[in-house]
Interface confidence: medium
């Protein structure tokens, strides 16, 4: 397993005042269909709003390494493989849940954390604001 | 407070040996910056590749209701407002953390899962398979 | 069909406490939160707090701290709602709305109140 | 808290006209912003959540729009079961707060 440097104050788990705690098992289950999501489509290169994935590492986080989605372009991809502006790339956003260790360096105290991710992007018809 | 049929199988929080278990502070500790995200982005209709927001439920899982994205066409909206089959919507995945009560019922315990949700679509050339 | 089933009128004297259930039923109950909204009469709508079974946490407007609380049983469905030290400015219609506390478009914990009770009426009066 | 404010207070309409309610937050919410209708002696009923999304149900008339700090709801073409007080909700931040309320009544 993993040593984790321990921090004298750690709060005790068996304290029924630590603030809305509860137990967690971490041997997380997954739920996916027995397809593999990891095969994870090269829709990043195909899309007509293509995007790079960008590495983000936090070693204090659970999962410590989350990708993020940022749009190459500010318009879209036609037919002709060139950027037509009349369109927007925009990035898809989710929050994901995430654990935290908290205090810094306790093996086994976390706070769930919400982060908010670029999935992917997609290509929308811009808004016109027109001036009077 | 709630009052939970308990479960008598409920672990101990004490256990030493419940597998890979840790206290989590629930109280979620929100990362997204300091300009609120929530905005109710119109994507989902002006995208060339637009999606429908269908519900999921399970009563023993945190978040009971996830709202997932379907793509409301095989092809993808061309500049006439027509769908373009020479194009294929296609739905972006990403996997979310959830809570299960596990042993149900225990309303102290729970177990992380990883879920597959469909968030948005983009449109992407086809892989087109020429039959010799 | 969802349905939220609140408890009979009540008519109080100033001082005494006052508990309303409100009875969920043709969906799930712990998934959700149950908030309690009241109106006075003629006025508009006040949230007054909350509970989310799934994990028992309750929440409430500083307005009504230290003299609401807020309870649900798992077994029975039911949500109830307490208010002690009752005035006459409690004469209201008190409701009990389900909070679908979804992951909506891509947030997690959004809330609205997707289905409400048929409100149950309490005068307070010497 | 959050304060949500409304416009106009009432509004005397004759049916098929379109009826415009504004609400106007005190501080960003986001899209965390709801549309409720309720009829005299009924409960509220959800029309609009999340500033646009109509719910199952809810007539196509009725729309919203906005995020931030202003929003609005619409009523395209009224008629004579939408008279009632309509009601704006944030749930960005606790505590929870409505809209004074909007009075609609038919001419």
């Known amino acids: 397993g993993i040593t984790i440097p321990r921090n004298p104050g750690c709060p005790n788990s068996e304290d029924k005042n630590f603030p809305r705690t509860v137990m967690v098992n971490l041997n997380i289950h997954n739920r996916n269909t027995n397809t593999n999501p990891k095969r994870s489509s090269d829709y990043y290169n195909r899309s007509t709003s293509p995007w790079n994935l960008h590495r983000n590492e936090d070693p204090e986080r659970y999962p410590s390494v989350i990708w993020e989605a940022k749009c190459r372009h500010l318009g879209c991809i036609n037919a002709d493989g060139n950027v037509d502006y009349h369109m927007n790339s925009v990035p898809i956003q989710q929050e994901i849940l995430v654990l935290r260790r908290e205090p810094p360096h306790c093996p086994n105290s976390f706070r769930l954390e919400k982060i908010l991710v670029s999935v992917g992007c997609t290509c929308v018809t811009p808004i016109v604001h027109h001036v009077a | 407070g709630i009052t939970i049929p308990r479960n008598p199988g409920c672990p101990n929080s004490e256990d030493k040996n419940f597998p890979r278990t840790v206290m989590v502070n629930l109280n979620i500790h929100n990362r997204n910056t300091n300009t609120n995200p929530k905005r109710s982005s119109d994507y989902y209709n002006r995208s060339t590749s637009p999606w429908n927001l269908h519900r999921n439920e399970d009563p023993e899982r945190y978040p009971s209701v996830i709202w997932e994205a379907k793509c409301r066409h095989l092809g993808c909206i061309n500049a006439d407002g027509n769908v373009d089959y020479h194009m294929n919507s296609v739905p972006i995945q990403q996997e979310i953390l959830v809570l299960r009560r596990e042993p149900p019922h225990c309303p102290n315990s729970f177990r992380l899962e990883k879920i597959l949700v469909s968030v948005g679509c983009t449109c992407v050339t086809p892989i087109v398979h020429h039959v010799a | 069909e969802v349905q939220l089933v609140q408890s009979g009128a009540e008519v109080k004297k100033p001082g005494e406490s006052l508990k309303i259930s409100c009875k969920a039923s043709g969906g799930s109950f712990k998934g959700y939160g149950i908030s309690w909204v009241r109106q006075a009469p003629g006025q508009g709508l006040e949230w007054m707090g909350g509970?989310?079974?799934?994990?028992?946490?309750?929440d409430y407007a500083q307005k009504f701290q230290g003299r609401v609380t807020i309870t649900a049983d798992e077994s029975t469905t039911t949500a109830y709602m307490e208010l002690s030290g009752l005035t006459s400015d409690d004469t209201a219609v008190y409701y009990c709305?389900?909070?679908?506390?979804?992951?909506?478009?891509?947030?997690?914990?959004?809330?609205?109140?997707?289905?409400w009770g048929q409100g149950t009426t309490v005068t307070v009066s010497s | 808290e959050i304060v949500l404010t409304q416009s106009p207070d009432f509004q005397s309409v004759t049916p098929k006209e379109k009826v415009t309610i504004t609400c106007r937050a005190s501080?960003?919410?986001?899209?965390?912003l709801h549309w409720y209708q309720q009829k005299p002696d009924q409960s509220p009923k959800l029309l609009i959540k999340?500033?646009?999304y109509s719910t199952s149900g809810v007539p196509s008339r009725f729309s919203g729009s906005g995020s931030g700090t202003d929003f609005t709801l619409t009523i395209n073409g009224l008629e004579a079961e939408d008279a009632g007080t309509y009601y704006c909700?944030?749930?960005?931040?606790?505590?929870?707060?409505f809209g004074q309320g909007t009075k609609v009544d038919i001419k």
């Open positions: 999340y500033a646009s």
């Open positions: 909700h944030q749930t960005d931040g606790l505590p929870y707060t």
């Open positions: 509970i989310t079974p799934f994990f028992g946490w309750t």
């Open positions: 501080q960003d919410i986001g899209s965390d």
């Open positions: 709305a389900r909070d679908p506390n979804e992951f909506w478009n891509g947030y997690y914990a959004t809330h609205d109140f997707d289905y």
